[in-house]
Interface confidence: low
């Protein structure tokens, strides 16, 4: 008698390894014999597809060499024209040993930046990824994290992060190791010990000492009053990435001596500078034909702004230059109490360095004006609104005295540091923080962003320097 098809062995979930054989069985009882068709993810499997073998009148489906793309739901449908067609479905789960599809590569990075070592994996079950540094498992912390993708992310890279890394992908079927890669951390040149200033008698010997570090180890050069040191002997030694340089001098004139530490990162250089003054006792007394003389700053208002032991120009057109210039700053300083927190530190730096200009010692002591670019940075980036208000008040004669006019430089009349980098002074201490800078327009309009204004800079690696460093 005719009998509608019945599937006596429903399909089950089949686990298979890549490149192995996987078989689904769909046993059917019926009369007459049914036609059996197979689908994968609802798409018909063609009888002539060479990746499959269909036997036993269609009751056995064999995948001859499983690929990871064979994952899915397989269904058999039996129909013999008696009653309705019947269907049974089962899943194929392709199991796969871990495989690293995007291994890490060697990375060279500057200290403080973010490093990402890729490690993308495949496998089923999904492999867990861990990392080995040297011979030990790498521990995650607030800086070091293994991302969901398996990549290793290191925030604020430190010197101690340098070393050999490899990633390990593991699941129940096995383990895969990447090749060993190298993370190299480079460090900007930094001065550890700055040369000290000396007040000596004519004809003395003085040794200036400068120590610097960085990766690669920096080189040290000495500059005398803006030029390469012409006399004196230099002794250098290097130990544990620290370079030590000693400049021995026979003193016949005052001078400003700058130690410059430089190292290379790819095609670019980083530079750190520190300066010391050599003054000669009884040398810098005001002479009749001089407009001023060099002396160490001894006031209070600009203490935090001017470099420690800064040599400043005191103008002898005042009866008491130190007191008169200090009063000038003090008067202008009081007016800064009302300006924005972005503008204030920048304006203070500008004021102090304009009124107490850096002094170049010599037979005729010379004041060194502020570089135009730094003045413009304060004017246009930090204090744009305040500057406009101040200029307006000046034109309308709203200030109590003319004194403030001396305290605000006219940027366009200052020398540019592109004419002669030694003819003008950089402003140290333009300290600012990101939070205060939300008033600045974003650099572009394509995506919203807030950027610290990038002030014109020389080749030195930082705009803000420690008080012991000179930026000349």
């Amino acid at each position: 008698l005719p009998k509608a098809p019945v599937i006596t062995t429903p399909l089950e979930t089949v686990d298979a390894l890549v490149e192995e054989v996987a078989t689904f069985m769909c046993a059917v009882e019926s009369y007459p014999q049914p036609e059996i068709s197979w689908t994968r993810n609802k798409i018909l499997i063609k009888l002539f597809d060479t990746r499959y073998s269909i036997r036993e009148n269609g009751q056995l489906l064999t995948i001859l060499s499983v690929e990871d793309s064979d994952d899915g739901i397989y269904c058999c449908t039996a129909n013999n024209g008696v009653g309705g067609a019947v269907e049974s479905c089962g899943a194929l789960q392709v199991k796969m040993k871990p495989k690293i599809t995007r291994p890490p590569i060697n990375v060279k990075i500057i200290e403080g930046l973010k490093a990402v070592l890729p490690c993308t994996t495949m496998g089923n079950p999904k492999p867990s990824v861990s990392w080995i540094k040297g011979d030990s498992p790498l521990r995650e912390n607030s800086r070091i994290a293994v991302l969901e993708s398996g990549s290793l992310r290191i925030h604020n890279v430190q010197k101690e992060d340098a070393g050999q890394y490899r990633c390990v992908a593991k699941n129940s079927l096995g383990t895969a190791y990447s090749k060993v890669v190298k993370l190299e951390v480079e460090v900007f040149a930094r001065i550890l010990r700055a040369p000290e200033s000396h007040n000596v008698t004519f004809g003395s010997f003085v040794t200036l000492h400068c120590t610097a570090t960085g990766i690669p180890v920096p080189t040290i050069t000495w500059i005398e009053n803006g030029n390469a040191v012409s006399s004196g002997s230099i002794q250098e030694s290097v130990k544990d990435r620290v370079i030590d340089s000693r400049l021995q001098l026979f003193i016949t004139k005052p001078g400003l001596y700058t130690c410059i530490a430089t190292n290379k990162h790819g095609e670019k250089f980083s530079t750190a500078k520190a300066a010391a003054t050599i003054s000669i006792a009884e040398w810098s007394k005001p002479q009749k034909d001089n407009k001023g003389y060099c002396a160490q700053y001894r006031g209070e208002v600009c203490n935090a702004v001017l470099a420690k032991d800064a040599l400043v120009f005191l103008n002898t057109s005042y009866a008491d230059p130190e007191e008169a210039q200090e009063l000038l700053v003090h008067t202008a300083w009081n007016e800064l109490k009302v300006v924005s927190p972005v503008c204030r530190p920048a304006a203070e730096a500008l004021l102090c360095n304009h009124i107490f200009q850096e002094c170049s010692p010599g037979v005729v002591p010379t004041p060194i004006p502020i570089c135009r670019e730094y003045c413009l940075a304060v004017k246009e980036l930090f204090c744009a609104k305040e500057w406009l208000v101040m200029e307006e008040k000046t034109h309308r004669g709203l200030y109590r005295s003319e004194m403030h006019l001396l305290s605000v430089p006219e940027c366009s009349k200052l020398p540019s540091m592109h004419w002669d980098p030694t003819a003008c002074a950089r402003l140290p201490h333009l300290d600012y923080n990101k939070e205060n800078l939300k008033t600045f327009p974003p650099m572009t309009s394509s995506k919203p962003s807030v950027d610290i204004p990038n002030l014109p800079s020389s080749s030195s690696s930082s705009f803000s320097v420690s008080p012991t460093y000179s930026m000349t």
């Epitope: 990375v107 060279k108 500057i110 990402v116 990162h265 790819g266 670019k268 650099m443």
Partner: antibody, heavy 124, light 107 residues
């Protein structure tokens, strides 16, 4: 020695697609920003797209937004520019260039290394 | 978008001349401005980065400066190998803009 080599240029019909490759050596794509810049015959330089793969950030010129996709495969140390819906005005020599550091730093470094360029011609 | 207007578009000069090329930004920008030299059939070469820093290996006769939104490339004494096209380029965080170029030709 740092080197960038572009490939994948050629003749394509308007509306067609092309994928340019930029194979880098002497530095790692993951620690730099990669940029595509094009130059139409007899014209100036025009920035097309940039990628900073350490941050996964990308950006595009308005003229190619939605049609071009920049990507990088750090395992191959290669950057790509997938160009779809090509127009006659996309005809140019396409250069890939690099700048050191991520998006926030690289602007100050300049595009210090460039490839030799690959010509893309869109014509029926 | 920020536009970089470069002038002049071309100039004729003799060997030894001082040449100045200017780029004006349409709005206030940072100092992330670079200058490039390009010769026919060749890729551009970086000359100046960060508005005024000389890229290593570039002769010191090239210099860059900034005044407000004006950026200047100066060639102090033009040499035979300097006849080329020069481009300025401004980098924002999400956008790069080139000037239209200045062709420096032999007078």
């Amino acid at each position: 020695e740092v080197q960038l080599v572009e490939s994948g240029g050629g003749l394509v019909q308007p509306g067609g697609s092309l994928r340019l490759s930029c194979a880098a050596s002497g530095f790692t794509v993951s620690s730099s920003s990669i940029h595509w810049v094009r130059q139409a015959p007899g014209k100036g330089l025009e920035w097309v797209a940039s990628i900073s793969s350490s941050y996964g950030s990308t950006s595009y010129a308005d003229s190619v937004k939605g049609r071009f996709t920049i990507s990088a495969d750090t395992s191959k140390n290669t950057a790509y520019l997938q160009m779809n819906s090509l127009r006659a005005e996309d005809t140019a020599v396409y250069y890939c260039a690099r700048s050191e550091g991520d998006r926030y730093v690289s602007g100050y470094m300049g595009l210090d290394y460039w490839g030799q360029g690959t010509l893309v011609t869109v014509s029926s | 978008d920020i536009q970089m207007t470069q002038s002049p578009s071309s100039l004729s000069a003799s060997v030894g001349d001082r040449v100045t090329i200017t780029c004006r930004a349409s709005q206030s920008v940072s100092s992330a401005v670079a200058w490039y030299q390009q010769k026919p059939g060749k890729a551009p070469k970086l000359l100046i980065y960060s508005a005024s820093s000389l890229y290593s290996g570039v002769p010191s006769r090239f210099s860059g400066s900034r005044s407000g939104t004006d950026f200047t490339l100066t060639i102090s004494s033009l040499q035979p190998e300097d006849f080329a096209t020069y481009y300025c380029q401004q980098s924002g965080v999400w956008l790069i803009t080139f000037g239209q170029g200045t062709k420096v030709e032999i007078k």
